[in-house]
């Protein structure tokens, strides 16, 4: 099959790297700089992908595979392929249009990317919180109540400002 | 493919609960909030709430404070909405909307087909 | 608390230039992103414009969006009967509050 395939197409012969030149009688020609071709019969080369302002080059590119790029630092990689760079944030954060803002009171973001999220409801496993939630780090959840022995007290949030109801911890 | 799927229409008397259940596929549903948003006859869009189902947390809308409770079952990656004390002003049609992880003033880029709860004695 | 502001409807005939408008009350709704949903009888909302002017993939590019200090705005040229539908705008109080616009119906003439 491969040999009457090749009969009829001479450019199935063209491997990665090359491209198959109508203008040449159909000889494997090298892909020209800045461009590859990552499988073999290729009519023509990708351009490669160039790593340039936020983006910067991870791999370059070779006659067979394309560049590929990651962010400055500062930055981090969003999309397949790092196809965008989003602004880091400080833990305690998360970016909104304006930038990176604190995250509202009731939610957290332990990481430099991302969305600040809520802090665990413990009530929900039945236990109670043992240390209480900041901007950057998530309650811990100890005992219920029932459970702690006499004179241990297990940590009461403090209550909303103006945001929006959380639920009860 | 990303998809939420919202359980059926309710009939309901004054008084009384529902609950609405959406199940999400095609993503990781521990990952991103979910809103629930209503809208009555005619009316437009109004927030109930929102869970992060990877720990249950919940924000409920100051309108909505202890008669909205929303619930997750990561087994089925499944959310829930119960709301309790009926009154007729509740019908509406009730939506699920995933909101993506990018910023924290995103857009709602998937949404429930929507639930019909109609309050009636 | 952010009340955004949109006219209740908007008109025009096949092909012309339709803007809606979404207004905001006080403060700056350049602070938060503007989200525009489009929603047809009977169905769940469908993103139009995303993060002020931003458009999702199969949406025309006869749909713009745009964002000023106090108002952000969805523009349709070349009006099709099948953009007939209501609009909505949608930001955030907090990042945690969403907060929509009334809705306007575009009705095409």
């Known amino acids: 099959f491969e040999r009457t395939r090749s009969l009829q197409d001479p450019c199935s012969n063209c491997p990665a790297g090359t491209f198959c030149d109508n203008n040449r009688n159909q000889i494997c020609s090298p892909c020209p700089p800045n461009s590859f071709s990552s499988a073999g019969g290729q009519r023509t080369c990708d351009i490669c992908r160039q790593c340039k302002g936020v983006f910067r080059t991870r791999k370059e590119c070779s006659s067979t595979s394309n560049a590929e790029c990651d962010c400055t630092p500062g930055f981090h990689c969003l999309g397949a392929g790092c196809s965008m760079c989003e602004q880091d944030c400080k833990q305690g954060q998360e970016l909104t249009k304006k930038g990176c803002k604190d995250c509202c009171f009731g939610t957290f973001n332990d990481q430099k990317r991302g969305i600040c999220r809520p802090w665990t409801n413990c009530s929900l496993d039945g236990k109670s919180v043992l240390v209480n939630g900041t901007k950057e780090r998530d309650v811990v959840c100890g005992p219920s109540p029932a459970d702690l022995s006499p004179g241990a007290s297990s940590v009461t949030p403090p209550a909303p400002a103006r945001e929006p109801g959380h639920s009860p911890q | 493919e990303v998809q939420l799927v919202q359980s059926g229409a309710e009939v309901k008397k004054p008084g009384s609960s529902v609950k609405v259940s959406c199940k999400a596929s095609?993503?990781?549903?521990?990952?991103?909030?979910i809103y629930w948003v209503r809208q009555a006859p005619g009316q437009g869009l109004e927030w109930i709430g929102n869970i992060w189902p990877g720990n249950g947390g919940t924000f409920y809308g100051e309108k909505f404070m202890g008669r909205a409770t929303f619930t997750a079952d990561t087994s089925t990656s499944t959310a829930y909405m119960e709301l309790s004390s009926l009154r007729s002003e509740d019908t509406a049609v009730y939506y699920c909307?995933?909101?993506?992880?990018?910023?924290?003033?995103?857009?709602?880029?998937?949404w429930g087909q929507g639930t019909l709860v109609t309050v009636s004695s | 608390q952010v009340v955004l502001t949109q006219p209740p409807s908007a008109s025009g005939t096949p092909g012309q230039r339709v803007t809606i408008s979404c207004k905001l009350n006080?403060?700056?709704?350049?602070?938060?992103?503007v989200h525009w949903y489009q929603q047809l009888p009977g169905t769940a909302p469908k993103t139009m414009i995303y993060r002020d002017d931003k458009r999702p993939d199969g949406v025309p590019d006869r749909f713009s969006g745009s964002s000023s200090s106090n108002s952000a705005s969805l523009a349709i040229s070349g009006l099709q009967s099948e953009d007939e539908a209501d609009y909505y705008c949608h930001s955030y109080d907090s990042t945690i509050t969403p907060v929509f616009g009334g809705g306007t119906k575009l009705t095409v003439l």
């Open positions: 006080s403060g700056n709704i350049g602070s938060y992103y």
């Open positions: 095609g993503y990781t549903f521990t990952s991103y909030y």
């Open positions: 909307a995933r909101r993506p992880d990018y910023s924290g003033d995103d857009y709602f880029d998937y």
